[in-house]
C-alpha cells in the first residue's frame, strides 16, 4: 500500500494545475490517443514560458486555493500510529539517482536562499520550480545529461545489488520475471518520485540546520 489513504492530497503548484488543464484539453481533443509524456511536458513547458502573468494568474489562484485547502486539512489530520517512520531501507542499497531538476536545485538553491533569507523551504522550492520552468530547454541539457548518466549507473548498480542479494533468482522462470518486470518498473518510478521529494526535503532541512549553526 502507499501510505495513509486518509492523508490529505498534497498541494499543487500553479504549473501543476496548468499541466493538468493541458492534459484535460488534450484528452477532450484526442480521447483515444496515447500521450508521449516527455513530448507533452516539453510542449507544456514551452507554452508556460510564453504565457503572460495575467494568463498564469488563474493557475496561481488555483494553487493558492489548493494550498489553503491542504493546510486546512493537515490541521485536522492525525497520522496513524507507527506509520510516522519511513519504511526500512537497506543502507547498503545504491542511492536513487537525482533528477535533472534536483541537480539544478543543488546549483541554484544557495543563491535563492542567500538572496531571500526569510523564505520558507516551500517558497525556496517554489522559486526553484519557477526558475526551472523558465529555463531554456538548452540550458537544462547539462542537468538532463548528468541525470541520465547517474540513472544508467544506478540501474547497473541496483541490478548488481539485487543479484547479490538473491543468488538463486537467476534459476527461476524468465517468462514470469519478464511479466512482472513492467509492473515493478512502474512501481519503482512512483517510488523514485516519492524518494526524490523526501530527499529534497531532507536536504533543505539539513541546510536549514546548517544555517542555524552559522
Amino acid at each position: 500500500g502507499k501510505g495513509d489513504p486518509k492523508k490529505p492530497r498534497g498541494k499543487m503548484s500553479s504549473y501543476a494545475f496548468f499541466v493538468q488543464t493541458c492534459r484535460e484539453e488534450h484528452k477532450k481533443k484526442h480521447p483515444d490517443a496515447s500521450v508521449n509524456f516527455s513530448e507533452f511536458s516539453k510542449k507544456c513547458s514551452e507554452r508556460w514560458k510564453t504565457m503572460s502573468a495575467k494568463e498564469k494568474g488563474k493557475f496561481e489562484d488555483m494553487a493558492k486555493a489548493d494550498k489553503a485547502r491542504y493546510e486546512r486539512e493537515m490541521k485536522t489530520y492525525i497520522p496513524p500510529k507507527g506509520e510516522t517512520k519511513k519504511k526500512f531501507k537497506d543502507p547498503n542499497a545504491p542511492k536513487r539517482p537525482p533528477s535533472a531538476f534536483f541537480l539544478f536545485c543543488s546549483e541554484y538553491r544557495p543563491k535563492i536562499k542567500g538572496e531571500h533569507p526569510g523564505l520558507s523551504i516551500g517558497d525556496v522550492a517554489k522559486k526553484l520550480g519557477e526558475m526551472w520552468n523558465n529555463t531554456a530547454a538548452d540550458d537544462k541539457q547539462p542537468y538532463e545529461k548528468k541525470a541520465a548518466k547517474l540513472k544508467e549507473k544506478y540501474e547497473k548498480d541496483i541490478a548488481a545489488y539485487r543479484a547479490k542479494g538473491k543468488p538463486d533468482a537467476a534459476k527461476k522462470g524468465v517468462v514470469k520475471a519478464e511479466k512482472s518486470k513492467k509492473k515493478k518498473e512502474e512501481e519503482e518510478d512512483e517510488e523514485d518520485e516519492e524518494d526524490e521529494e523526501e530527499e529534497e526535503d531532507e536536504e533543505d532541512e539539513e541546510e536549514e540546520e546548517d544555517d542555524d549553526d552559522e
Epitope: 510564453t50 546549483e107 544557495p110 519557477e130 523558465n134 548528468k146
Partner: antibody, heavy 123, light 107 residues
C-alpha cells in the same frame, strides 16, 4: 562595488598555451554562473565558455572545444580559462562575464563584465 | 547555431533623435533576447534583458520589444553618451550568439 578583473593575457606563439584569470569582488561569486566572451580586433562579440556555480557543469563554443578549459575556485573568488593549442584566430580581447540566470523572465544575461585582457597569437 | 542579424549595421543620428535598431533571429527564441551597449575600448554593458526588461541603472529612454524572431531596441531621445555600438544576443540556446552590432554615430 561589483567588479571582475581579468589577467594573464599576452603574446603567445601558435600552438602555445596561456591561462587567463578573473578575480571577482563585491558579490557572492559561488552563487553565479560565469562565462568567457571574446572579441577579435574590430569584430563583434563571441561567447567562448560557461561554468555553473559549483563548477560541476561546463559548456564550450565549438571553435574552442577540446582546446580550452574553463574552471573556477570559489574559495578564491576566481574564474580561469586554460587555453592550449592556440591559433591565430584566437587573437582577441577576452572578457570574463557574470551570467545572471533569470528567475522569472527566463533566459540568462551577461550582467557584469570585466575590462578584458588581450591575447595575441602570432609567430 | 542560431544566427542573429542586426539592422542597420550603422546609422547617423543627432542628439534628441528617436533611434530604432532591429534584430532578427534565424529561429524563434521566444523572449530570450538581451541588448548590450559597447563604447570603444570598453567592456559591453547590459541594457535590456528578456527582450523588454530594463536592467537596473539603465536610463528609461532605452526600451526593448518583440518576441519570437523579431526584436527592437529603441532610444527615445538620443543623448551624447549614447553614441556607441549596440549588440543583441540570444540566450535561448548554446552557443550564445550575438548580432554583428549596430554602430550609432553622430550626424
Amino acid at each position: 562595488e561589483v567588479q571582475l578583473l581579468e589577467s594573464g593575457g599576452g603574446l603567445v606563439q601558435p600552438g602555445g598555451s596561456l591561462r587567463l584569470s578573473c578575480a571577482a569582488s563585491g558579490f557572492t561569486f559561488s552563487w553565479y554562473d560565469m562565462s568567457w566572451v571574446r572579441q577579435a580586433p574590430g569584430k563583434g562579440l563571441e561567447w567562448v565558455s560557461r561554468i555553473s556555480p559549483s563548477g560541476g557543469y561546463t559548456m564550450y563554443a565549438d571553435s574552442v572545444k577540446g582546446r580550452f578549459t574553463i574552471s573556477r575556485d570559489n574559495s578564491k573568488n576566481t574564474l580561469y580559462l586554460q587555453m592550449n593549442s592556440l591559433r591565430a584566430e584566437d587573437t582577441a580581447v577576452y572578457y570574463c562575464a557574470r551570467l545572471e540566470v533569470g528567475a522569472t523572465s527566463g533566459g540568462t544575461a551577461f550582467d557584469i563584465w570585466g575590462q578584458g585582457t588581450m591575447v595575441t597569437v602570432s609567430s | 547555431d542560431i544566427q542573429m542579424t542586426q539592422s542597420p549595421s550603422s546609422l547617423s543620428a543627432s542628439v534628441g533623435d528617436r533611434v530604432t535598431i532591429t534584430c532578427r533571429a534565424s529561429q524563434s527564441i521566444s523572449s530570450y533576447l538581451n541588448w548590450y551597449q559597447q563604447k570603444p575600448g570598453k567592456a559591453p554593458k547590459l541594457l535590456i534583458y528578456a527582450a523588454s526588461s530594463l536592467q537596473s541603472g539603465v536610463p528609461s529612454r532605452f526600451s526593448g520589444s518583440g518576441s519570437g524572431t523579431d526584436f527592437t531596441l529603441t532610444i527615445s531621445s538620443l543623448q551624447p553618451e549614447d553614441f556607441a555600438t549596440y549588440y543583441c544576443q540570444q540566450s535561448y540556446s548554446t552557443p550564445r550568439t550575438f548580432g554583428q552590432g549596430t554602430k550609432v554615430e553622430i550626424k
